[in-house]
Interface confidence: low
Amino acid sequence: GGGGSKHKCFRNSLENNETLESIMNTLESEEDFRKYFYYLEGSK
């Protein structure tokens, strides 16, 4: 499987207040990446 430890499902303000610039031109935050992996690992 994907490996990696489980993380709490983080909320990220960028997710709700996204602009064209913010998703592609700001660096992906560490919390953001953890959140996605938590969701995908947890969905199996």
């Epitope: 490996g3 990696g4 998703i23 592609m24 995908l40």
Partner: antibody, heavy 118, light 112 residues
Amino acid sequence: QVQLVESGGGVVQPGRSLRLSCAASGFTFSSYGMHWVRQAPGKGLEWVAVISYDGNNKHFADSVKGRFTISRDNSKNTLNLQMNSLRAEDRAVYYCARGASGFVLDIWGQGTMVTVSS
Amino acid sequence: DIVMTQTPLSSPVTLGQPASISCRSSQSLVRSDGNTYLSWLQQRPGQPPRLLIYKISNRFSGVPDRFSGSGAGTDFTLKISRVEAEDVGIYFCMQTTQFPFTFGPGTKVDIK
């Protein structure tokens, strides 16, 4: 400018190993997840693997699971794909790609060709 | 795995005329965060893929506004309002909602 350059492709016999590398420049490499995607000659795209920004999370396509490993060296801005037990069906151009938020593959390298042949 | 299908697989178009490509997923691409992770990529002959559209309808930086994306759930469309010579190539849809990430088979766009 933002750039990804793959290397390490070549001709290898079935069952042997090959290590691909991807050199990143023009962005903060340590802040992005990175992917490998491959494309067999004349065929479509197949996602291979992803590694998180810190290297702690990895995920693989079933077709390569247990044979390929993905790693990164953030101090050298380098992504690697170690390919073991290569098969004829692994013959493809291998692209590295940057993963933006939501795993959007926004920047792609030019690719490196891997040929598996006896 | 989520299976992505595209129609048509080949689309001969006239310069200056519109073109439309459909992409369908075998299950909904809406993730629990409310976002739909459907992208469109262009691959010109002899070139690597290039991101055009992300999250259904958002144009990536530098992509001409003649490209637009729409859709929801399992059905998505890429439209080119007026095809130019540089638009020749293969167009792929891709989902990054669920592992393993998967691509459509591609639609070849060429000039009549």
